[in-house]
Interface confidence: medium
């Protein structure tokens, strides 16, 4: 989750990640070009609520200050760990040209060529080592290894990095061997659910644009609000059908049949007081989808959820009621009422897929995660467009840890707050070709909402 160039003994000891941009060693953060400056990391100091009651026990508190307290602060539309890139939605050498908004479309409406580009890009991301970032394999206190001289890091592929980010946001706090503190989640069960997953997808989309050399590459979405008992993207033409001889595995006719998963052995990491190190841990699995005749959410569920005008409500947790966020996440019923026995929308779609996709720490291993969350984000975006909320709609304090408005989303780096992603998709350089009105449009006639 940190730039490779910063994970040196000096960088870790000095807690400073302000790399130079280009060959000029003094051009830290693109400073000589006016792109940014090395600055003190700002973190949210307001109180949080919820079940995490410890203090200074977790690497992710005050993120990312346990690791780096000085990072590049980019000016204008510049972005990136060395201010060498542009903010989402901007392009050009000076990042002052608005990029034409890319269009995220229903996966079923892609042409054969577009479908191949998407699936090929995912496969390429699974096989390509990330050029700039590494993952940490030990906790903050053990980050320099047993001798205190060797940063404990590992290379991993672009897609596995995407998986690791999700794992790290939900992993337990480790208090010692086999002593996990589980009451913590930086990307679910609170308002940050929508912004965290939005940034997560934007990150992957940008990586896939870079890998494919196509700046207008867009992630498709899976409209899971069909009310059916089948996964219509689980086919060999799309994200892989079930294997005949072992339906928990993916058909050999799909490129995803060979995908191995990372970050699945949570109990093992807890026992060894370590972090997921990107080692492959077996094949991707989807147990029988829609077990017990479970059905996917319906379009009516989506519409009910969109009719909730309050973004979130106290205690900003999984028991919030009449909260758009909690209904979308799926802890509330779609109409905003609470029924702890019921899963809905996003949660129901994950549960329906069973297998790897049903466990938060490993869910992102399954490429269905990408298109599932793309649709979840489309619902969030529709709500934003309908309600045009001010930032005050987001709690400044007393949300669970990681979920206050100004908290830096864990473990994204350089730091980015929830507030920075509480914008319409268009402001971030993309749009959805989706119609979430009463009549469900056939996939061949999608319209821009």
């Amino acid at each position: 989750q940190f730039p490779r160039v910063c994970m040196t003994l000096d960088g870790v000891l000095n807690k400073e990640c302000c790399p130079p941009l280009g060959p000029e060693a003094t051009n830290i953060c693109g400073f000589l070009e006016g792109r940014g400056q090395c600055a003190e990391v700002q973190t949210d100091t307001r109180p949080w609520s919820g079940p995490y009651i410890l203090r200074n026990q977790d690497d992710r508190e005050q993120w990312p200050r346990k690791f780096f307290n000085r990072t590049c602060k980019c000016t204008g539309n510049f972005a990136g760990y060395n201010c060498g890139g542009c903010k989402f939605g901007w392009t050009g050498p000076d990042c002052n040209r608005k990029k034409p908004a890319i269009l995220r479309r229903n996966i079923h409406s892609l042409t054969a060529q577009e479908r191949e580009q998407f699936l090929g890009a995912l496969d390429l991301a699974k096989k390509s080592i990330h050029p700039d970032y590494v993952i940490t394999t030990q906790h903050w206190l053990g980050l320099l290894g047993p001798n205190g001289t060797q940063p404990q890091i590992a290379n991993c592929s672009v897609y596995d990095f995407f998986v690791w980010l999700h794992y790290y946001s939900v992993r337990d706090t480790l208090l010692g061997p086999g002593r996990p503190y589980k009451a913590i989640d930086f990307s679910h069960q609170g308002p940050a659910f929508v912004t965290w997953h939005r940034y997560h997808l934007l990150w992957l989309e940008r990586e896939l644009q870079r890998l494919t050399g196509n700046e207008s590459f867009a992630l498709p979405y899976w409209n899971f609000a069909t009310g059916k008992n089948e996964c219509d993207v689980c086919t060999d033409e799309l994200l892989g059908a079930a294997r005949q001889d072992d339906p928990t595995l993916i058909s050999r006719n799909s490129r995803f049949s060979t995908w191995e998963i990372v970050c699945d052995s949570l109990d093992d990491y807890n026992r060894r007081v370590t972090l997921c190190n990107g080692t492959y841990e077996g094949l991707l699995r989807r147990n029988k989808v829609g077990r017990n005749n479970e059905k996917l959410p319906t379009l009516k569920n989506v519409q009910d959820c969109l009719s909730l005008q309050k973004f979130d409500s106290p205690p900003f947790f999984q028991n919030s009621t009449f909260s758009f966020r909690n209904a979308l996440e799926g802890f509330d019923k779609a109409d905003g009422t609470l029924d702890s026995q019921v899963m809905n929308l996003h949660n129901l779609a994950h549960s329906f897929l069973n297998g790897t996709n049903a466990l938060p720490h490993s869910a992102a291993n399954d490429p269905v995660f990408v298109v599932l969350h793309s649709f979840t984000d489309a619902i969030f975006d529709e709500w934003l467009k309908r309600n045009n909320p001010s930032t005050d709609a987001w709690p400044q304090e007393l949300a669970p840890i990681g979920h206050n408005r100004m908290y830096n989303m864990v473990p994204f780096f350089p730091p980015v707050t929830n507030e920075e992603l509480f914008l319409t998709a268009e402001q971030l350089g993309y749009n959805y070709a989706v119609d979430l009105s009463e009549e469900e449009a056939p996939v061949w006639s999608t319209t821009l909402s």
């Epitope: 302000c18 090395c38 003190e40």
Partner: antibody, heavy 122, light 107 residues
Framework: EVQLVESGGDLVKPGGSLKLSCAAS????????MSWVRQTPDKRLEWVAT????????YYPDSVKGRFTISRDNAKNTLYLQMSSLKSEDTAMYYC???????????????WGQGTSVTVSS | DIQMTQSPASLSASVGETVTITCRAS??????LAWYQQKQGKSPQLLVY???TLAEGVPSRFSGSGSGTQFSLKINSLQPEDFGSYYC?????????FGGGTKLEIK
């Protein structure tokens, strides 16, 4: 109390060299970037050089690049400015100043010394 | 290089008055601007950085505002110790440059 005391200013001939020093006290010198700023006889202020807290990074305007070298000795809490190939337009009061935020480099200077005078004339 | 243009070059005011000094950057410097005060025979002192953040120990009658290319320093209820010269300086990308200064004199 933060104190910066410059020394080494003198009258020097064009083409000559001079080394200025700045002794720092009252703060953790190694945590701060430092700069030299000069004030010309017509009272204009001109930034001359900056060095990062650890000494790894140095910055100069084009007007002095290649002629002036900023350096520091964190063990001695001292900042230096080595000036060579001096020109008449380098005549000024030279101030050493502390960068106001404890980052690698930040351009607002929160403490200044009393200055040392450099005159370049034949 | 970014040019900083200060106005007025000089200004006379009385104790208790409110004065405003402006500074214009030749290009967008966002909020990377500092203001300094210099009294006769003394070295400059930082008043404001990041366009509006008061430096430690600076009285609240001083306030900075602006972003992009237009900035101002306002001094409410002038005190005798406020007379002297004022300089703006951008701290965006190097080279950092200063304005030509504004001399504030007692009327």
């Amino acid at each position: 109390e933060v104190q910066l005391v410059e020394s080494g200013g003198d009258l020097v001939k064009p083409g000559g060299s001079l080394k200025l020093s700045c002794a720092a006290s009252g703060f953790t010198f190694s945590s701060y970037g430092m700069s030299w700023v000069r004030q010309t006889p017509d009272k204009r202020l001109e930034w001359v050089a900056t060095i990062s807290s650890g000494g790894s990074y140095t910055y100069y305007p084009d007007s002095v690049k290649g002629r002036f070298t900023i350096s520091r000795d964190n063990a001695k809490n001292t900042l230096y400015l080595q000036m060579s190939s001096l020109k008449s337009e380098d005549t000024a009061m030279y101030y050493c100043a502390r960068l106001g935020v404890t980052t690698v480099v930040h351009g607002a200077m929160d403490y200044w010394g009393q200055g040392t005078s450099v005159t370049v004339s034949s | 290089d970014i040019q900083m243009t200060q106005s007025p070059a000089s200004l006379s005011a009385s104790v208790g008055e409110t004065v405003t000094i402006t500074c214009r950057a030749s290009e967008n410097i966002y909020s990377y601007l500092a203001w300094y005060q210099q009294k006769q025979g003394k070295s400059p002192q930082l008043l404001v950085y990041n366009a509006k953040t008061l430096a430690e120990g600076v009285p609240s009658r001083f306030s900075g505002s602006g972003s992009g290319t237009q900035f101002s320093l306002k001094i409410n209820s002038l005190q005798p110790e406020d007379f002297g010269s004022y300089y703006c300086q951008h701290h965006y990308g190097t080279p950092w440059t200063f304005g030509g200064g504004t001399k504030l004199e007692i009327k």
